[in-house]
């Protein structure tokens, strides 16, 4: 369960892949599409509001006690829209929604390395946001083998802290 309904902190950042492609968001036919693309040098990177929430790890009920906290994030590229996991379609979509946000909008944050993060579905442990065919998709990761899989690694370039955009 998420410890508090308010985020413990928020940041505004641009999101790029391990290979430095940008994650961009485009309004098309009244819905948003998510793209993974090389940006032209003069083009500004799209920004995402990351809200960080604390959550007790499920295993904390069986031995980890109060220390078993995870950081979960929600990602909002524009007001009232959030990235959400569609586990049936193995896709990542942008949906307009009101708070409280659905579980599909929460992702467990992993620092894979000093400057790379991964986003694990709260609703489907072991499934991460990843890059497939120039789009974001949900990718199942075998913990024992593919912890460093480049297609689930992202770079966050934080811009500044922010109340809302």
């Amino acid at each position: 369960s998420i410890t508090g309904i308010s985020p413990i902190t928020e940041s505004l950042a641009s999101l790029s892949t391990y290979n430095d492609q940008s994650i961009t968001f485009a309004l098309e036919d009244e819905s948003y599409e998510i793209y993974v693309e090389d940006l032209k040098k003069d083009k500004k990177k799209d920004k995402v509001l990351l809200s960080y929430y604390e959550s007790q790890h499920p295993s904390s009920e069986s031995g980890d006690g109060v220390d078993g906290k995870m950081l979960m994030v929600t990602l909002s590229p524009t007001k009232d829209f959030w990235l959400q996991a569609n586990n049936k379609e193995h896709s990542v979509e942008l949906h307009k929604c009101e708070k409280p946000l659905p579980d599909q909008a929460f992702f467990v944050l992993h620092n894979r390395s000093f400057n790379c993060v991964s986003f694990e579905c709260k609703t489907d442990p072991g499934v991460f946001i990843g890059v497939k065919d120039n789009h974001l998709a949900l990718i199942k990761v075998d913990y024992s083998e593919n912890l460093g899989s480049e297609n689930i690694l992202f770079k966050l370039s934080e811009i500044h802290h922010h109340h809302h955009h």
Partner: antibody
């Protein structure tokens, strides 16, 4: 209850080597970033090394880079610090610390009591 | 590398006083800053994380604020058990501690 117990400290001559260990218990060791932090006598805290949960990446400040190596054995719930080419300025209490959250490199939520390393001839 | 400059390096205060310690980062660290308390002969203890979040069990007289490069730890009413050394710590880009502030009895 989270516990971190350091061992392996002692007196060593300049140029010598030492291996510190940290035995972890009370939490899922393999899910956390781990750290070594040191404190020279009467001085402040200095971050010495960091390692990712799966030991895929490790990090050091310039002051110890190339001389110190952090490692971990998740099967044994143990963290290590191999210290080579020791200098007098490495004399300090060495603390093992655990990340505050599962999977992330933010904050040092739990600390051991430390082990003293003295480098002197 | 990011440098963290803490001030003052020491201060004398009385029980009941309001105490403020500041930490300045050499570049923007957003809100990736903690405060730790250390008593003589003991390991440091996490007090505040992500600039303003109190660690479980830490009294509410402790508070943190700031963003970017300038941060503050405030103890609203100093208690006898608060006499200790306090360190800021950034984890936005690498990991760096401030030099520490020793809070002594006046």
């Amino acid at each position: 209850e989270v516990q971190l117990v350091e061992s392996g400290g002692g007196l060593v001559q300049p140029g010598g080597s030492l291996r510190l260990s940290c035995a972890a218990s009370g939490f899922t060791f393999s899910s956390y970033w781990m750290y070594w932090v040191r404190q020279a006598p009467g001085k402040g805290l200095e971050w010495v090394a960091s390692i990712t949960p799966n030991a895929g990446e490790d990090y050091y400040p310039d002051s110890v880079k190339g001389r110190f190596t952090i490692s971990r054995d998740n099967a044994k719930n143990s963290l290590y610090l191999q210290m080579n080419s020791l200098r007098a300025e490495d004399t300090a209490v060495y603390y093992c610390a655990r990340g505050h959250y599962y999977y992330t490199s933010y904050s040092l939520g739990y600390w051991g009591q430390g082990t003293l390393v003295t480098v002197s001839s | 590398d990011i440098q963290m400059t803490q001030s003052p390096s020491s201060l004398s205060a009385s029980v009941g006083d309001r105490v403020t310690i500041t930490c300045k980062a050499s570049q923007n660290i957003n809100k990736h800053l903690d405060w730790y308390q250390q008593k003589p002969g003991k390991a440091p203890k996490l007090l505040i994380y992500f600039t303003n979040n109190l660690q479980t069990g830490v009294p509410s007289r402790f508070s943190g604020s700031g963003s970017g490069t300038d941060f503050t730890l405030t103890i609203s009413s100093l208690q006898p058990e608060d006499f200790a050394t306090y360190y800021c710590f950034q984890y936005n880009n690498g990991w760096t501690f401030g030099g520490g502030t020793k809070v002594e009895i006046k």
